[in-house]
Amino acid sequence: SGLNDIFEAQKIEWHELPRWRQQWSGSGTTSRFPETVLARCVKYTEVHPEMRHVDCQSVWDAFKGAFISKYPCNITEEDYQPLVKLGTQTVPCNKTLLWSRIKDLAHQFTQVQRDMFTLEDMLLGYLADDLTWCGEFNTFEINYQSCPDWRKDCSNNPVSVFWKTVSRRFAETACGVVHVMLNGSRSKIFDKNSTFGSVEVHNLQPEKVQALEAWVIHGGREDSRDLCQDPTIKELESIISKRNIRFFCKNIYRPDKFLQCVKNPEDSSCLSGI
């Protein structure tokens, strides 16, 4: 018992470790991170009149406050609440586009179909898209050397928690018919472990969302299979249906033609299937 007490007394907490920088498995904070976030905020508020009231310095302060001086494996959704509050935005009903493992096409689509919105078309998603960031416990420094990797280090890191937080909010506020773009080239077209599968699906509100329509994007030109019959799509269909939300699925056999037809719906070739 006395020996145990000695060992207990010698336990060292992570925050008591000497002041060398922790080495994480992931890449460090994106260079010029504060400047990038601030510049993106200014640009966004200039282009979106409904967000002109947003004070970008306050946005940066709230963003910074979520992770600076905090142990980067102990970040919570609560840490991001001041930022979420400042970035509150609504999407009109029937205009939400979710995506999973097919970000580029989803963004190309909303660039053409300007009245539909992905998370990255909203202020907070736009600010953080493709960026990495983390701080260190008890210092005001940003760690540009390394940040925690979701798999190898911890899931409660600043980037993962940010996307979980804003994705949850984005799904919670969706209404009407919600669309989701899924990658038909992947082995798991619907992946329960993706942000869409683990966060967004479970936060769509049955009182506000009448239906989820999945667009399964085919990869190969000769791929004529009905991927809406894929077992993972059936799994998604069941999960959504049991949330009392109707589920529809469409194959997008030709994504190039699909985009072309969004740009030019009157094109005669667009009357046939895509």
Epitope: K242, R243, I245, R246, F247
Partner: antibody
Framework: QSVEESGGRLVTPGTPLTLTCTAS????????VTWVRQAPGKGLEWIGI?????TTYYATWAKGRFTISKSATTVDLRIASPTTEDTATYFC?????????????WGPGTLVTVSS | AAVLTQTPSPVSAAVGGTVTIKCQSS????????LSWYQQKPGQPPKLLIY???TLASGVPSRFSGSGSGTQFTLTISSVQSDDAATYYC???????????FGGGTEVVVK
């Protein structure tokens, strides 16, 4: 908007029987449809559901005994080999105008009697 | 398979009184809230009252209310009227559709 079941009749045990659910005022193909039955003087029993896509799910006790299918305008319930225990009023219920497993719209029911 | 137990049955109530019907599930329903309540009168099909445990269906009087989550649910009828005499059923939806089931029903007698 309404739904109605048809096809109920007196059959001998083992004679396959198909019941049909038809909608008025809306298209059944865009909605989830559930089949429920009620033996005389007894409670309700959930048989199964057909999704918009045609995916079907059944209560454990109903698997292999019942098949739900759909066409553009109707949803069918096939009783493969009826026994006397299948004597009941059969209801189809549609999740119209919204919902899936929630059943706001019921038909009046159709009576199936299985007797030798 | 899941078992939904409704208590009590039958239940007697005076006009203007309150009736509480309980529905207990042997396992948790989907999302802890996928349970609905139906009213059935003799010779008629069931009528939806409450869905997702507590949401009042369109056209249903506000004296009907639902509560509960997971495995324990309650249907409350306040200011009972003679027209409320009927049998009430709960319907649970589960992760495995094979388990989906109605409760045994609770008959409400209005005096």
């Amino acid at each position: 908007q309404s739904v109605e079941e048809s096809g109920g009749r007196l059959v001998t045990p083992g004679t396959p029987l198909t019941l049909t659910c038809t909608a008025s005022g809306f298209s059944l193909s865009r909605y989830y449809v559930t089949w429920v039955r009620q033996a005389p003087g007894k409670g309700l029993e959930w048989i199964g559901i057909i999704y918009i896509s045609g995916t079907t799910y059944y209560a454990t006790w109903a698997k292999g005994r019942f098949t739900i299918s759909k066409s553009a305008t109707t949803v069918d319930l096939r009783i493969a080999s009826p026994t006397t225990e299948d004597t009941a009023t059969y209801f189809c219920a549609a999740a119209w105008p919204v919902g899936t497993y929630v059943l706001p719209l019921w038909g009046p029911g159709t009576l199936v009697t299985v007797s030798s | 398979a899941a078992v939904l137990t409704q208590t009590p049955s039958p239940v007697s109530a005076a006009v203007g009184g309150t009736v509480t019907i309980k529905c207990q599930s042997s396992q948790s329903v989907v999302n802890a809230n996928n349970l609905s309540w139906y009213q059935q009168k003799p010779g008629q099909p069931p009528k939806l009252l409450i869905y997702l445990a507590s949401t009042l269906a369109s056209g249903v009087p506000s004296r009907f209310s639902g509560s509960g989550s997971g495995t324990q649910f309650t249907l409350t009828i306040s200011s009972v009227q003679s027209d409320d005499a009927a049998t009430y059923y709960c319907l649970g939806v589960y992760d495995d559709d094979g388990d989906n089931a109605f409760g045994g029903g609770t008959e409400v007698v209005v005096k």
